[in-house]
């Protein structure tokens, strides 16, 4: 008995070889004995039924005189899982069709976080072994239902899943969207009054995108966190629903999600959670964004530069004057040297000699008020 | 072809009312966001007022908030301006215009209407 | 609202010439702006959106550039029928707002 393996949806290709090489006349048939198609002499492909009840079964009229009669079930379906036999030259060929299905749970559109579970459907009496392959190569295996929890941002694009069976094999390819912000986390460095921008962009694309969001404020300086602003998402298109007064913050209306902040000031640094809950689906996408403001200061003969909001204990902030060697350079949030000579002095906030922030405040002789470019 | 033609101006009191109306064809009419904007006698561009595509949601410069309302009806492929308590300010040319796909610009204006506000 | 400021308000040129207009925005606004002419008596017709891209139909000469709060709109090779006032709109959010106005007058 010959197996052949099919995908549900797809065609499979059932064969019946003559020894002769040349055009014959062949019967397909169920295993019950009712006909399916055939060719009776006359090189004229005759249909065991009625058209609507036969329409997915088909051959090749162009291998008849190469001595080859397959059959061809088109748009399979799991039921067509059976034994065909083809008659031809006083002999009986039976052919085992094997229809299978994977499917993901639910939806192949999932939240970051969330598990995806891949299931194969097989007929009575297979035994397949099933392997996944992730879109970042990673393998998993196992018997008719495939587990991967906490899905990640690179787990999204083509899962190939090879089903195997009596050494033969067939392919599925499953597309899977985890639904996810680019990044898990960003940071703005920004000087005293200067204009922020946070950007939200979304790791996927999708023709219709509706649901509600919100950004939640944690200020340094705060007690507790606050709601600074509430939009709806409908097919791509935002709308701010509430915003506190202070900050006065702008949000575009388009993708990606994007929020002005008109000026970086002390009382507002530190860090955001942006939530975003999609329409029909469990669970939210997040993103923390974190803001850290710079400023440099001369108060009589103390000359200071601050940094407010998260910064991490390796940051080195530093005041030098232009040109020179740093005067002063500590892994602390605040730094400043008495009586600083006149001249451009730079506060600078570096990792490892990078520099994140820099703020210029000019020192003039001890008669005169210090100036900020 | 894709096509705005604006109707609806003339001649007003101070404290009147008049609704603008843009008859749109060969496009999606309900797919897409629309505008209204003006332009009184030799100044520049003022938008006026939007209504967004699918969702429907309205927007209007603070210059005629309270006075003006947009609307629009899909079956009859028609944007709407109303307005009312007009003041001679709001003397202008009134054109509709359609914007691209995901906002990509205003691509389709209308020929305008004229509005005159004046006792 | 979003200010945009467009400068200069007039411009003189030659045909032939290359012509720079920018408008700033009082805030940031990705590149969500677009650049509109007019010529007296007509509508006005789309020359660029998102900042940079080109509508259809728009000769190649016409090109604009920037994003965040300063915009610059380019003609490369001026044409007897560029002479007309340019716009910029600010399309990032509601309520949306024109710069004030460019006329390129020939010389």
């Known amino acids: 008995k010959t197996l052949v393996l099919g995908k549900e949806g797809e065609s499979a290709e059932l064969p019946c070889e003559s020894s002769q090489k040349k055009i014959t006349v062949f019967t397909w048939k169920f295993s019950d004995q009712r006909k399916i198609l055939g060719q009776h002499g006359k090189g004229v492909l005759i249909r065991g039924g009625s058209p609507s009840q036969f329409d997915r079964f088909d051959s090749k009229k162009g291998a008849w005189e190469k001595g080859s009669f397959p059959l061809i079930i088109n748009k399979l379906k799991m039921e067509d899982s059976q034994t065909y036999i083809c008659e031809l030259e006083n002999r009986k060929e039976e052919v085992e069709l094997w229809v299978f299905k994977v499917t993901a749970n639910s939806d192949t559109h999932l939240l970051q976080g969330q598990s995806l579970t891949l299931t194969l459907e097989s007929p009575p009496g297979s035994s397949p072994s099933v392997q996944c392959r992730s879109p970042r190569g990673k393998n998993i295996q196992g018997g008719k239902t495939l587990s991967v929890s906490q899905l990640e941002l690179q787990d999204s694009g083509t899962w190939t899943c090879t089903v195997l069976q009596n050494q033969k094999k067939v392919e599925f390819k499953i597309d899977i969207v985890v639904l996810a912000f680019q990044k898990a986390s960003s940071i703005v460095y920004k000087k005293e009054g200067e204009q922020v921008e946070f950007s939200f962009p979304l790791a996927f694309t999708v023709e219709k995108l509706t649901g509600s969001g919100e950004l939640w404020w944690q200020a340094e300086r705060a007690s507790s966190s606050k709601s600074w602003i509430t939009f709806d998402l409908k097919n791509k298109e935002v709308s701010v629903k509430r915003v506190t007064q202070d900050p006065k913050l702008q949000m575009g209306k388009k993708l990606p999600l994007h929020l002005t902040l008109p000026q970086a000031l002390p009382q507002y640094a530190g860090s955001g959670n942006l939530t975003l809950a999609l329409e029909a689906k469990t669970g939210k996408l997040h993103q923390e964004v974190n803001l850290v403001v710079m400023r440099a200061t001369q108060l009589q003969k103390n000359l200071t530069c601050e940094v407010w909001g998260p910064t991490s204990p390796k940051l080195m902030l530093s005041l030098k004057l232009e040109n020179k060697e740093a005067k002063v350079s500590k892994r602390e949030k605040a730094v400043w040297v008495l009586n600083p000579e006149a001249g451009m002095w730079q506060c600078l906030l570096s990792d490892s000699g990078q520099v994140l922030l820099e703020s210029n405040i000019k020192v003039l002789p001890t008669w005169s008020t210090p100036v900020q470019p | 072809e894709v096509q705005l033609l604006e109707s609806g101006g003339g001649l007003v009191q101070p404290g009147g009312s008049l609704r603008l109306s843009c008859a749109a064809s060969?496009?999606?009419?309900?797919?897409?966001?629309m505008s209204w904007v003006r332009q009184a006698p030799g100044k520049g561009l003022e938008w006026v007022s939007g209504?967004?595509?699918?969702?429907?949601?309205?927007y209007y410069a603070d210059s005629v908030k309270g006075r003006f309302t947009i609307s629009r009806d899909k079956s009859k492929n028609t944007l709407y301006l109303q307005m009312n308590s007009l003041r001679a300010e709001d003397t202008a040319v009134y054109y509709c215009?359609?914007?691209?796909?995901?906002?990509?610009?205003?691509?389709?204006w209308g020929k305008g209407t004229t509005v005159t506000v004046s006792s | 609202a979003i200010q945009m400021t467009q400068s200069p308000s007039s411009l003189s040129a030659f045909v032939g010439d290359r012509v720079t207009i920018t408008c700033r925005a009082s805030?940031?606004?990705?590149?969500?702006l677009g650049w509109y002419q007019q010529k007296p008596g007509k509508a006005p017709k789309l020359l660029i959106y998102?900042?940079?891209s080109l509508q259809s139909g728009v000769p190649s000469r016409f090109s604009g550039s920037g994003s965040g709060t300063d915009f610059t709109l380019t003609i490369s090779s001026l044409q007897p029928e560029d002479f007309a006032t340019y716009y910029c709109?600010?399309?990032?959010?509601?309520?949306?707002?024109f710069g004030q106005g460019t006329k390129l007058e020939i010389k």
């Open positions: 805030q940031g606004i990705r590149n969500d």
């Open positions: 209504i967004s595509g699918s969702v429907g949601s309205t």
């Open positions: 709109l600010q399309d990032y959010n509601y309520p949306y707002t």
């Open positions: 998102a900042a940079s």
């Open positions: 060969g496009f999606t009419f309900s797919s897409y966001a």
């Open positions: 215009a359609k914007e691209g796909y995901d906002w990509s610009g205003m691509d389709v």
